[in-house]
């Protein structure tokens, strides 16, 4: 999906108001300084790009993210402000569904949100040039 | 403007299944989370599930699998939830309520009017 | 699963009456996850304050939220004949969605 025509403000105000309190939430009890980000994105499709990645795609250690509070919202968002976005993600949904499991919440989950995290922060900085 | 019609009500046996409908109508069906409740008469509010339509994902109250299965079709924006195995435990009405962001807080936003189930013998 | 204690369970006021439902929450939510619905009898529950203190459309500016963490609440500075209702709390918090029992408030 190309994210390029997606409102990025509205986005950008669902994110500060909810999904960011529920990623907080997720990582309740984890050290801000405990994973290293190593993800990141250039501009604001690209970073949607790799957060709906991150957030919807299976990873080895982590095959939970999807059904967690923050990707149901983030969905909502993505589906309402990036049109056609709901269309497109029929057939990568179906597929996944037999691989996900619901509350396994790994190391590896934790790391991922991190990523998210910062995948997020640099989001809501698009003018930031990147490091 | 946005609506959700649902079915009228039911009255059905013990151990048959209803399916139930919510037609949604005034915005893109297929973009945002479809949310099921219960409520027994005299009774306070439960969450069944919810359903996307956009692709048919669905999250379930635990309590509720096995009991509810929510499906949708695009194509007429309607959602539907069966309900199998009823026994009186199941008496109750039932709605739908679109899941949407208001002032980018997400909430239950519209909800339908409601569907009756009663069941006896 | 994140438990809501609403109290009172029922309660009347006068008109003029200030009147505090309060929403107890099992573990500690975000104030955006946490809303209010307001039903009356023999009708669809309707929104009445988003995350904690955003009134919904249309509703009075007597009605006001507040709160954070594991304790919320819901405040009417003077209680109108209209306001007789059910009202209850619900967070979007974790699966699964719950509710609080509610709160009757009466006219009295």
């Known amino acids: 999906y190309d994210f390029t025509n997606c409102d990025f403000e509205k986005i950008k105000a669902a994110y500060l108001s909810t999904i960011s309190k529920d990623l907080i939430t997720y990582m309740s009890g984890t050290k801000s300084t405990e994973f290293n980000n190593t993800v990141s994105c250039s501009n604001r499709p690209h970073c949607l790009t790799e957060i709906q990645s991150l957030t919807f795609n299976p990873t080895a250690g982590c095959a939970s993210l999807a059904k967690e509070m923050f990707a149901m919202k983030t969905k909502a968002a993505l589906a309402i402000w990036c049109p056609g976005y709901s269309e497109t993600q029929i057939n990568a949904t179906q597929a996944m569904k037999k691989r996900r499991k619901r509350k396994v919440t790994t190391n590896k989950c934790l790391e991922q949100v991190s990523q998210l995290q910062g995948l997020w922060r640099r989001f809501n900085r698009p003018l930031l040039k990147q490091q | 403007q946005v609506q959700l019609q649902q079915s009228g009500a039911e009255l059905v046996r013990p151990g048959s299944s209803v399916k139930i409908s919510c037609k949604a109508s005034g915005y893109a069906f297929s973009s945002y989370w479809m949310n099921w409740v219960k409520q027994r008469p005299g009774q306070g509010l439960e969450w069944i599930g919810q359903i996307f339509p956009g692709d048919g994902e669905t999250n379930y109250n635990g309590k509720f699998k096995g009991k509810a299965t929510l499906t949708a079709d695009k194509s007429s924006s309607t959602a539907y939830m069966q309900l199998s195995s009823l026994t009186s435990e199941d008496s109750a009405v039932y709605f739908c309520a679109r899941g949407g962001y208001v002032n980018f807080l997400y909430a239950m936003d519209y909800w339908g009017q409601g569907t009756s189930v009663t069941v006896s013998s | 699963e994140i438990v809501l204690t609403q109290s009172p369970a029922l309660m009347a006021a006068s008109p003029g009456e200030k009147v505090t439902i309060t929403c107890s929450v099992s573990?500690?939510?975000?104030?955006?996850?946490l809303h209010w619905y307001q039903q009356k009898s023999e009708t669809s529950p309707k929104p009445w304050i988003y995350?904690?203190?955003t009134l919904a459309s249309g509703v009075p500016v007597r009605f006001s939220g507040s709160g954070s963490g594991t304790s919320y609440s819901l405040t009417i500075s003077s209680m109108e004949a209209e306001d007789a209702a059910t009202y209850y709390c619900q967070q979007w918090s974790s699966y699964p969605l719950t509710f609080g029992a509610g709160t009757k408030l009466e006219l009295k």
């Open positions: 995350g904690t203190s």
């Open positions: 573990s500690s939510i975000s104030s955006s996850n």
